[in-house]
Interface confidence: medium
């Protein structure tokens, strides 16, 4: 079942719960981190634990089997079921934002395509809870800076609607 850290607002679904493939990653992050990069997967959304677990597996399978990465690229994935799904977690360098940004940031990705709509309130709360959790655990600096994926790479991610939304979050800083 989900692990609930007392400092976290959102439960985090551990890898074994969503039946992740074993990670082959070895590069550790140097905590606490100064940056968070928000993206979207641009694929299917999900709104139940069962469908979100499946979607997390789909993303991981694509990243590992098609792209040849050591694991799913994101540190965490956010489902519209209001749950956070553990990707590479707080300790391992992701593959979400390019060579410069990956080692200095946590990549969180909303499962779905948010060009034309915003995520559910539950998903937004889950993401915000995760960030609060990161600060409380010492994984993120208290003055961390939030970026949209398109702020650091040439991409449409995290989608127009989600991008506009995160620009109003307190830690967001425009490029």
């Amino acid at each position: 079942q989900e692990t609930e850290d007392p400092a976290c607002c959102s439960p985090i679904v551990p890898r074994n719960e969503w039946k992740a493939l074993a990670s082959e990653c070895a590069q550790h992050l140097s905590l606490p981190l100064r940056y968070v990069v928000v993206s979207h997967t641009a694929g299917s959304s999900c709104n139940t634990p069962a469908s979100c677990q499946q979607q997390a597996r789909n993303v991981q399978h694509y990243h590992m089997k098609t792209l040849g990465w050591c694991d799913v690229g994101y540190n965490f994935l956010i489902g519209e079921d209001g749950l956070v799904y553990e990707g590479r977690g707080w300790n391992f360098t992701g593959a979400h934002s390019g060579h410069l940004w990956n080692p200095m940031s946590i990549g969180i990705s909303f499962m779905g395509n948010y060009m034309d709509r915003v995520p559910t309130p539950q998903a937004i709360r889950a993401a915000q809870g995760l960030l609060a959790c990161g600060v409380a655990q010492g994984a993120l600096r208290s003055n961390y800076v939030l970026k949209g994926h398109r702020d650091v790479q040439r991409t449409l991610s995290p989608g127009n609607q989600l991008y506009h939304l995160i620009q109003n979050w307190p830690h967001y800083r425009s490029p």
Partner: antibody, heavy 119, light 107 residues
């Protein structure tokens, strides 16, 4: 508007360390990385390193790890770079520079300090 | 370290010319490439960020293109005040590195 003020010149004896200053104004000093760039006379630009004034996190070009020490004084919004055991190779103009936002180009530059190492 | 090579080393132009300055990275850097202009006895000035994004206050005659390892800074109608040295900068990975520079001069 963003301003980075540096002294025009410093004369230093070989082996005697020198501490260069860069006073920032017109923005929140603790919110942006401060970079240092070296330019030898008639030569190109070399990135020395950067420091985040909020907590003094530093990223240094390994080439300068035994040469440059970066510090800040938040109370005066001033960044410093100390050069240890200077030689003639350290004679150069040293610029402080601030990113536009984060890692997206040095949009704001000081006027540079000309360091001359001479006996 | 990523090595940035610029060509030509010197470019002699006539006002009104359209010129292209080249920058090549020793490995792919996507579009993490910034361009600067440095006039004699002045600090560098940021012209273009992320290969092609314009900077507020920079004349529209300056434009950038390219991705991967090959990049170009174009000046579509050179003005006399454009003389100086132009540098590209790797913003892809540490250490941040600058190109060797292209000196733009008038014929």
């Amino acid at each position: 508007q963003v301003q980075l003020q540096q002294p025009g010149a410093e004369l230093v004896r070989p082996g005697a360390s020198v501490k260069l200053s860069c006073k920032a104004s017109g923005y929140s000093f603790t919110s942006y990385w401060m970079n240092w760039v070296k330019q030898r006379p008639g030569q190109g630009l070399e990135w020395i390193g950067m420091i985040h004034p909020s907590d003094s996190e530093t990223r240094l070009n390994q080439k300068f790890k035994d040469k440059a020490t970066l510090t800040v004084d938040k109370s005066s919004s001033t960044a410093y770079m100390q050069l240890s055991s200077p030689t003639s190779e350290d004679s150069a103009v040293y610029y402080c520079a601030r990113d536009y936002s984060d890692y997206d180009g040095f949009a704001y530059w000081g006027q540079g300090t000309l360091v001359t190492v001479s006996a | 370290d990523i090595v940035m090579t610029q060509s030509p080393a010197t470019l002699s132009v006539t006002p009104g010319d359209r010129v292209s300055l080249s920058c090549r990275a020793s490995q792919s850097i996507s579009d993490y490439l910034h361009w600067y202009q440095q006039k004699s006895h002045e600090s560098p000035r940021l012209l273009i960020k992320y290969a092609s994004q314009s900077i507020s206050g920079i004349p529209s005659r300056f434009s950038g293109s390219g991705s991967g390892s090959d990049f170009t800074l174009s000046i579509n109608s050179v003005e006399p005040e454009d003389v100086g040295v132009y540098y590209c900068q790797n913003g892809h990975s540490f250490p941040l590195t600058f190109g060797t520079g292209t000196k733009l001069e008038l014929k």
